[in-house]
């Protein structure tokens, strides 16, 4: 089936926005005013995955770029990366597992759990201007809660 997608931005629970940091990395920092235009717009696609009544499988692409967040092992550690794909073939309903995140809504906040690595989440640091990463702990120092803002196409 044609994949359903929406455009959105994400902010962590400390209100930090996500921006590009080099060609293949995202970082989180507080933005205000005109600087808000720097934040990345995601194309969130609703894909096949191990869907449950409270987990919705999604893929997170960067709008109008052929880049998707993906989860891979690097030096034996689950790692978040931006991966380049063939724009002719993506997005698709049947994404490879490394591209899939379980979107979990709890108390109006969103978590994004890696489908490839259960209990690992898209995370940001408390500190400013640090990379967005895949974290294996919830409720600790690192931030795993996000809010989503819809962006018109």
């Amino acid at each position: 089936a044609p994949v359903r997608s929406l455009n959105c931005t994400l902010r962590d629970s400390q209100q930090k926005s996500l921006v590009m940091s080099g060609p293949y990395e995202l970082k989180a920092l507080h933005l205000q005013g005109q600087d808000m235009e720097q934040q990345v717009v995601f194309s969130m696609s609703f894909v096949q995955g191990e869907e449950s009544n409270d987990k919705i499988p999604v893929a997170l692409g960067l709008k109008e770029k052929n880049l998707y967040l993906s989860c891979v092992l690097k030096d034996d550690k689950p790692t978040l990366q931006l991966e380049s794909v063939d724009p002719k073939n993506y997005p698709k309903k049947k994404m490879e597992k490394r591209f899939v995140f379980n979107k979990i809504e709890i108390n109006n906040k969103l978590e994004f759990e890696s489908a490839q690595f259960p209990n690992w989440y898209i995370s940001t640091s408390q500190a400013e201007n640090m990379p967005v990463f895949l974290g294996g702990t919830k409720g600790g120092q690192d931030i795993t809660d996000f809010t989503m803002q819809f962006v018109s196409s």
Partner: antibody, heavy 122, light 107 residues
């Protein structure tokens, strides 16, 4: 060889509950999802819900409040608990293995058990 | 939820006949349609999985076609053992949904 064997069916009083078991072999429950499906006498097939390899569950909305699917990986067994039974829950209950092929066919079901008959009657 | 409308609900045919069953879905499901055969007192048996793929060991007289919302299942030359009930199942999205079934009877 993949096999699924249901058990636990029988006569249940209206308002009662049932707990069915599905013992599997030939595959590991931590890797594959398992669905429950039922078929009322002379009727079609109705999908009830599933449990994924990681333990997450999805229930079909009309029955969500009355169903619990669980599993014990070490016993290679999946369970279906259903509460507040009524006459229209009388059916053969099947479990089936999900294909769980990422990027290809995640939701299709390939192997089915023989089924167990549940009769709800006073 | 994707609803699946299967027709006909019953069908009388003779050995050697060509038989066609249709399933129409309420949403575009790409090629994610599956076809099952069920005989009395037995569980459904998967004949054709999504992508119109014939399962290993299933005779080549069984075939299917279609994508999007319109799907067809064909038995090219009916054999005595083919008299059974046939179901389609969409596996594009949850909840999984079946067609109402087609009972194939001897004329």
């Amino acid at each position: 060889e993949v096999q699924l064997v249901e058990s636990g069916g029988g006569l249940v009083q209206p308002g009662g509950s049932l707990r069915l078991s599905c013992a599997v072999s030939g595959f590991t429950l931590s890797d594959y999802g398992v669905s429950w499906i039922r078929q009322a006498p002379g009727k079609g097939l109705e999908w009830l819900g599933l449990i994924w390899g990681g333990g997450d569950t999805y229930y079909n909305s009309p029955l969500k409040s009355r169903l619990t699917i669980s599993k014990d990986n070490s016993k290679s067994t999946v369970y279906l608990q259903m509460n507040s039974l009524r006459a229209e829950d009388t059916a053969v209950y099947y479990c089936a293995k999900q294909r769980t092929l990422w990027g290809y066919d995640l939701y299709g079901m390939d192997y089915w058990g023989q089924g167990t008959l549940v009769t709800v009657s006073s | 939820e994707t609803t699946v409308t299967q027709s006909p609900s019953s069908l009388s045919a003779s050995v050697g006949d060509r038989v066609t069953i249709t399933c129409i879905t309420s949403t575009d499901i790409d090629v994610d349609m599956n076809w099952y055969q069920q005989k009395p007192g037995k569980p459904p048996k998967l004949l054709i999985s999504q992508g119109n793929t014939l399962r290993p060991g299933v005779p080549s007289r069984f075939s299917s076609s279609g994508s999007g919302t319109d799907f067809t299942f064909t038995i090219s030359s009916l054999q005595p053992e083919d008299f059974a009930t046939y179901y389609c199942l969409q596996s594009d999205n949850l909840p999984l949904t079946f067609g109402q079934g087609t009972k194939l009877e001897i004329k």
